[in-house]
């Protein structure tokens, strides 16, 4: 019971932590900037993997993709291969674990099998949650260490002035999303492979067995390791696998030619 | 490199109209506000018109009911209709854009502006 609860709990944990990946990868709010006022509108930008938003504050928000860039960073384009890794390892998994959920019955299929798809999909889920949590704090440290705050000056050479907005990049809501969705992935996948543990099938104990003594109606019960290491209540020393299981008190004595000096 | 260059500028007659148009060029990527600025002798730079990218208006006082400013978002072009126009007028007007470059991720902003043209008002 405790292991289904386990197993179950891990697969809805997961598939919410996947759910999250997702959202957050093609949320634009990764990186925000300080809302600055122009004399005509106040202006809010932010920007996500994907594409660049402005908002106004009319409420007009107009969203631009990356595509017409020059050049897109080697680390952003790191970012997006670790998200999407994330969510194709996690959609895996989550595959598997449907299949590998003990209260689902598919045909004939065993316990091992349904063990080693658990872990698997354990597997699955955690590399997706690590792959999200990387991913999003590559992105942070990108802001961190480059873009965190801009405000140089530079003059055009036609006589007109260019100047840099002074605008700082913070955390964009994307960013939280992330690291919180990797983190459930990852607790979903441990759950994973905690309740394979419990599925996988067990050595046989081989517990109470009846010996019948030939010639006797005396059933016997060995006493295990401690009878047979004279341990325990064994005050009788009884002989273990003697046929008769008889104490060597009952012990029929043959005549010995001793017995007739 | 970004740039924005005005045109339209000329010597005009008290009560005559202007047009001046404003074109940003280079490695754009978008623009969010554009806007005419002036600058009378020995003044303050002051704004004149602006518009924002989801057609957002702001007028100066003085231009209110005499210039309307457009734009053209696919040409990355903005436009300044002048009317009436009044000795006091006269100025070097100055383009502004608030504009992204296509140069670098994180998208940066910049504030760019033109090296004016002078509208004069005088019989």
């Known amino acids: 019971m405790a292991v289904t609860a386990c197993q179950g709990l891990g697969f809805v944990v997961s598939l919410i932590g996947i759910a999250g990946i997702i959202a957050a990868t093609c949320m634009d709010q990764w990186s925000t900037q300080d809302l600055y006022n122009n004399p005509v509108t106040a202006v809010f930008n932010y920007q996500g993997l994907w594409r660049s938003c402005v908002r106004e504050s009319s409420g007009f928000t107009e969203c631009r993709g990356y595509f017409t860039l020059l050049g897109l960073p080697a680390m952003l384009q790191a970012v997006r291969a670790l998200m999407i890794v994330g969510i194709v390892l996690g959609a895996i998994g989550l595959l598997v674990s449907i299949f590998a959920l003990k209260c689902i019955r598919i045909g004939s299929m065993e316990d091992s099998a349904k063990a080693n798809m658990t872990l698997t999909s354990g597997i699955m889920f955690i590399v997706s949650g690590l792959c999200a949590i990387a991913g999003v704090s590559v992105f942070a440290n990108m802001l961190v260490t480059n873009f965190w705050m801009s405000t140089a000056n530079m003059y055009t050479g036609m006589g007109g002035m260019v100047q840099t907005v002074q605008t700082r990049y913070t955390f964009g809501a994307a960013l939280f999303v992330g690291w919180v969705a990797g983190g459930l992935t990852l607790i979903g996948g441990v759950m994973m492979c905690i309740a394979c543990r419990g599925l996988a099938p067990e050595e046989t104990n081989y517990k109470a067995v009846s010996y019948h003594a030939s010639g006797h109606s005396v059933a016997y019960k060995p006493g295990g390791f401690k009878a047979s290491t004279g341990f325990g209540s064994n005050t009788k020393n009884k002989k273990i696998y003697d046929g008769g299981a008889r104490t060597e008190d009952e012990v029929q004595s043959y005549p010995s030619k001793h017995d007739y000096v | 490199e970004v740039q924005v260059v005005e045109s339209g500028g000329g010597l005009v007659q008290p009560g005559g109209s202007l047009r001046l148009s404003c074109a940003a060029s280079?490695?754009?990527?978008?623009?969010?506000?554009m806007g005419w600025y002036r600058q009378a002798p020995g003044k303050q730079r002051e704004l004149v018109a602006g518009?924002?990218?989801?057609?957002?208006?702001r007028y100066a006082d003085s231009a209110k009911g005499r210039f309307t400013i457009s734009r053209d978002n696919a040409k990355n072009t903005v436009y300044l209709q002048m009317n009436s126009l009044k000795p006091e007028d006269t100025a070097v007007y100055y383009c502004?854009?608030?504009?992204?470059?296509?140069?670098?991720?994180?998208?940066?902003?910049?504030?760019?502006w033109g090296q004016g043209t002078l509208v004069t008002v005088s019989a």
């Open positions: 502004n854009a608030d504009l992204a470059t296509a140069t670098s991720w994180p998208v940066r902003y910049l504030e760019v």
């Open positions: 280079g490695s754009i990527f978008s623009i969010n506000v």
């Open positions: 518009i924002s990218t989801g057609g957002t208006t």
